[in-house]
């Protein structure tokens, strides 16, 4: 049994890091493998992650972590029984994938303005709370070409757009994702999408 693709890990910079790797053949990850991880810190304790299958030869492990900060560095040991298959390290702050924003809501009761709001996925005491920027994706269910991205570079988790920038009388969906420049993160996953029917009063044309 050998590791074909070494584990790569990303952290949500809060409580979970996810590591993925591939074996050289079909593997029952949860029964055959264990990923041991330990913070390189005084008094830290070793933890064991039981991996799950991620495709025939792929494995994924969700590592639980406390009080993640930029100084943290973890040792990782991948075991198959008594055999050490791979040894490495992981610094969560250097591989951050933020949590996805939640509670995306479209408020259509403001006069001819769409207000989209969502929740910051981090608590106020987490460093990322004040450092997330967002991308909002809006698309038409009827017209695949009607697909747009709005970059939200301010801290407030909201976006206002004129309803008239979208077509009237059809349904739209929206979703939002986040990233943080300070840690050069990857983008988060998209939030679950929300749907609304876009309708607004066309202004009378003057002749």
């Amino acid at each position: 049994m050998k590791v074909l693709q070494e584990p790569t890990c990303v952290s949500d910079y809060m409580s979970i890091s996810t590591c993925e790797w591939k074996m050289n053949g079909p593997t029952n990850c949860s029964t055959e493998l264990r990923l041991l991880y330990q913070l390189v810190f005084l008094l830290s304790e070793a933890h064991t992650c039981i991996p799950e299958n991620n495709g025939g030869a792929g494995c994924v492990c969700h590592l639980l972590m406390d009080d993640v900060v930029s100084a943290d560095n973890y040792t990782l040991d991948l075991w198959a029984g008594q055999q050490l298959l791979w040894k490495g390290s992981f610094k969560p702050s250097e591989h951050v994938k933020p949590r996805a924003p939640g509670n995306l809501t479209v408020h259509t009761n403001v006069s001819d303005t769409l207000l989209l709001t969502w929740s910051n996925p981090y608590p106020p005491d987490n460093y990322l709370y004040n450092h997330l920027t967002y991308a909002v994706n809006i698309w038409s269910e009827n017209d695949p070409a009607d697909f747009r991205i709005y970059n939200v570079t301010y801290l407030e988790p909201s976006l206002r757009i004129a309803a008239s920038t979208l077509k009237s009388g059809i349904s739209y969906r929206a979703r939002v994702r986040a990233w943080a420049q300070c840690y050069n993160t990857t983008w988060s996953e998209w939030s679950p999408s929300t749907k609304w029917h876009n309708s607004y009063r066309e202004p009378f044309e003057q002749h």
């Epitope: 005084l42 008094l43 304790e45 406390d66 009080d67 900060v69 930029s70 100084a71």
Partner: antibody, heavy 116, light 111 residues
Framework: QVQLVQSGAEVKKPGASVKVSCKAS????????MHWVRQAPGQGLEWMGI????????SYAQKFQGRVTMTRDTSTSTVYMELSSLRSEDTAVYYC?????????WGKGTLVTVSS | QSVLTQPPSVSAAPGQKVTISCSGG????????VSWYQQLPGTAPKLLIY???KRPSGIPDRFSGSKSGTSATLGITGLQTGDEADYYC????????????FGTGTKLTVL
């Protein structure tokens, strides 16, 4: 919000021991290390030691080895610092402070006076 | 005694800028991150800067931190009378056993 509530002031005689408590609330108690830091009157901050509340393991500053004991009670989310063989130089305010590499939150402090 | 050295005192007028230095060595500041604490008279210390230059939620951006080599600096702009306090740097040292040294402390007087 995070709160670290410390026990009240103590007056002790030289040679005696003192046990200071620090009750934590507003966060997951076992997820954060706890430090103890003291400050003698008019002096600076002095680190004494650290405890991992999850397993109870400890590490102490060399200066206090053999005299200090840190413990925790997870059922009450409380950490304790006991200092023995007290001398007058141990008169200080003793603080508990939550954190790993740095101290996010501090208790208000417990004044321990050692006097004959 | 502390292995991190700070000036005993600094002073400046309201609205001015002040910097406080913290000098250490390769086994502490040179190999770790620096934090700064503010201690107002008669109160417990409060975390002001961590990770060399990050501010906890609620700390105004008048406070800034930087690190270069084995030294660190705390900067305070737009001084206010309420900033009058003792300031301590802190880090951790892994040269022999893990320890958390603090700086000698700096008394800031707002004139």
């Amino acid at each position: 919000q995070v709160q670290l509530v410390q026990s009240g002031a103590e007056v002790k005689k030289p040679g005696a021991s003192v046990k200071v408590s620090c009750k934590a609330s507003g966060y997951a108690f076992t997820s954060y290390y706890m430090h103890w830091v003291r400050q003698a009157p008019g002096q600076g901050l002095e680190w004494m030691g650290i405890i991992n509340p999850r397993g109870g393991s400890t590490s102490y500053a060399q200066k206090f080895q053999g005299r200090v004991t840190m413990t925790r009670d997870t059922s009450t989310s409380t950490v304790y610092m006991e200092l023995s063989s007290l001398r007058s130089e141990d008169t200080a305010v003793y603080y508990c402070a939550r954190g790993k590499y740095w101290m996010y939150d501090w208790g208000k402090g417990t004044l321990v006076t050692v006097s004959s | 005694q502390s292995v991190l050295t700070q000036p005993p005192s600094v002073s400046a007028a309201p609205g001015q800028k002040v910097t406080i230095s913290c000098s250490g060595g390769s086994s502490n500041i040179g190999n770790s991150y620096v934090s700064w604490y503010q201690q107002l008279p008669g109160t417990a210390p409060k975390l002001l800067i961590y990770d060399n230059n990050k501010r906890p939620s609620g700390i105004p951006d008048r406070f800034s931190g930087s690190k270069s080599g084995t030294s660190a600096t705390l900067g305070i702009t737009g001084l206010q009378t309420g900033d009058e306090a003792d300031y301590y740097c802190g880090t951790w040292d892994t040269s022999t056993v893990w320890e958390w040294p603090f700086g000698t402390g700096t008394k800031l007087t707002v004139l």
